[in-house]
């Protein structure tokens, strides 16, 4: 996979203890019943593999057909493999479902690299390790694809959790989460804890390990430490947010904050890397290189292509800087910052050197479609997609990978003026010209 691919970087063994997690006391504002507390049945319901995505088990049809589905906050279609494919162990067989309804409509989704196309229908859908409900949802039955499914990834479909505006073929196709909230009493909120292993996992380890949690309808206190800080969802299409400042090891990049959000900034579990607009990427890499100048690395490493290896256990984490993104806060002129470690932005890669080595790819890359806060960012944090209140919350993840000297952080408040000016206003275009892929 290339460094720009829109699939998450990894899952696996996190730093938090597994098993039952008890809710803890909080002094945060009370919210309506059912929104907070312990969601034991949903904790640890995600699995996955390096660079290939976090997936949840879902059932489709009657009788239920079990499939693993990639969790993607950067798209809005529920789409599943519905025909034989060399990379699929199983697929949705519509003819075996008594509750399948054909919408007699096709859908075609081109990515920058690759595509999928299929036929639209509806069927009954549930999430075994989720809320105890069944909903009738739109399903795109993928009949043809190119460079979409990944060999060995163990998922057979994609759950687009973003808003209807970016659904294909158009915004009239109701996304799964909208259907779920409309048809049930599930609150209009979900939260994600993606747990990076910090080291590569082979296939059997992945299947046996935990990749994180998708809490549908609530917030589980055991999945984070400290406080949740919220940033407004600027516009309900992607999960768009506004970055107001960027620091490398505490040094401000000192760019016009519009550059950080050119042409948008989104939170996307379906992207591996932290992806930055060209100018921001160049400034950030220059700063990271300067901070880590005691060692030099090949040009291809900074392009996310070449791997750098160290003898097992000797990775010099301390020479790499922390990266802080300041996000617009909920209060006027107030921001907060999220800080990630090299343990998040250096991605462990498997099967390339000897067992005596730890090898990594640089997981920050250049974007022509704005900032994408992919798994590199999300693996540091518990992320709350509070659709009801049009906001996204960040707290330090209980499973993030760190060392004895530094930890990921969510801190605030900071005074930041004129934050509204940091948003970029995309000129209105014919929607048919939009590219789905974020390569």
């Amino acid at each position: 996979t290339q460094h720009g691919i829109r699939l998450p970087l990894r899952s696996g063994l996190g730093g938090a203890p597994l098993g039952l997690r008890l809710p803890r006391e909080t002094d945060e504002e009370p919210e309506e019943p059912g929104r907070r507390g312990s969601f034991v049945e949903m904790v640890d319901n995600l699995r996955g593999k390096s660079g290939q995505g976090y997936y949840v088990e879902m059932t489709v049809g009657s009788p239920p057909q079990t499939l693993n589905i990639l969790v993607d906050t950067g798209s809005s279609n529920f789409a599943v493999g519905a025909a034989p494919h060399p990379f699929l162990h199983r697929y949705y067989q519509r003819q075996l479902s008594s509750t399948y309804r054909d919408l007699r409509k096709g859908v075609y989704v081109p990515y920058t690299q690759g595509k999928w196309e299929g036929e639209l229908g509806t069927d009954l859908v549930s999430i075994p390790h989720g809320p105890n409900v069944t909903v009738r949802a739109n399903i795109a039955a993928i009949t043809e694809s190119d460079k979409f499914f990944i060999n060995g990834s163990n998922w057979e479909g994609i759950l687009g959790l973003a808003y209807a505006e970016i659904a294909r073929p158009d915004d009239s196709l109701e996304p799964f989460f909208d259907s779920l909230v409309k048809q049930t009493h599930v609150p209009n909120l979900f939260s994600l804890q993606l747990c990076g292993a910090g080291f590569p996992l082979n296939q059997s380890e992945v299947l046996a390990s935990v990749g994180g949690s998708m809490i549908i309808g609530g917030i589980d206190h055991s999945l984070y430490t400290g406080s949740l800080w919220y940033t407004p969802i600027r516009r309900e299409w992607y999960y768009e947010v506004i970055i107001v400042r960027v620091e490398i090891n505490g040094q401000d990049l000192k760019m016009d904050c519009k550059e950080y959000n050119y042409d948008k900034s989104i939170v996307d579990s379906g992207t591996t890397n932290l992806r930055l607009p060209k100018k921001v990427f160049e400034a950030a890499v220059k700063s990271i290189k300067a901070a880590s100048s005691t060692e030099k690395f090949p040009d291809g490493f900074w392009l996310g292509e070449q791997l750098v290896c160290w003898q097992a256990g000797t990775t010099p984490w301390n020479i790499f800087p922390v990266i802080s993104l300041y996000l617009m806060g909920e209060v006027t002129n107030q921001s907060f910052r999220i800080t990630i470690l090299p343990q998040q932005y250096l991605r462990p890669v498997e099967d390339v050197a000897t067992s005596q080595d730890d090898c990594y790819k640089f997981a920050i890359s250049q974007s022509s479609t704005g900032t994408v806060m992919g798994a590199v960012i999300m693996e540091g944090f518990y992320v709350v997609f509070d659709r009801a209140r049009k906001r996204i919350g960040f707290a330090v993840s209980a499973c993030h990978v760190h060392d004895e000297f530094r930890t990921a952080a969510v801190e605030g408040p900071f005074v930041t003026l004129d934050m509204e000016d940091c948003g970029y206003n995309i000129p209105q275009t014919d929607e048919s010209t939009l590219m789905t892929g974020r390569a």
């Epitope: 690395f297 090949p298 292509e305 070449q306």
Partner: antibody, heavy 120, light 108 residues
Amino acid sequence: QLQLQESGPGLVKPSETLSLTCTVSGGSISSSSYYWGWIRQPPGKGLEWIGQIYYSGSTFYNPSLKSRVTISVDTSKNQFSLKLSSVTAADTAVYYCARLGHGYSYFDLWGRGTLVTVSS
Amino acid sequence: EIVLTQSPATLSLSPGERATLSCRASQSVSSYLAWFQQKPGQAPRLLIYDASNRATGIPARFSGSGSGTDFTLTISSLEPEDFAVYYCQQVYVWPPRTFGGGTKVEIK
């Protein structure tokens, strides 16, 4: 024009330490554009990377040799050195020093090599 | 560990003929591959880097191609001075420690 020249004893006894020096002439070892490396080639066999160093002293070693290898740099003398301890007959080889250029990725300039024989 | 396999081990050709040397990686190394030439009693010389770029001073009859796992060094018309051993090396995994076993191009 930049040149590399290896120097050191051609015969080392088993269990002793092999010591070689590479002198860089016609350019500065303190250039930020290069690493400096050692590669060896046993008689009639292929090439084996030993390790490399940046002028700041940052080193990378072949895991199979790491416990026995030390590479150091002396910027004042425009030299870098190789020490390989506890040698055996299997360490008999032509030892080359080389420059790692093209974005720190490729050995684009090599010394002529020096044969080191391990024998009592 | 990435293993580079060169074939054939020996290639017997006459001057003026075209030489095609293969280097296969056990897994993808993208385009991060070099080719070296080594004559008897001499140090290796960099011919090609990044799979297809000729190093400074290398004649145009040498060309490299390929990406991923399969790479080829082509000498369009062999000159007498081209008879030597050729090695490939991957630098996708860095530091660049993996060389192929070599292909000897000898006079037929």
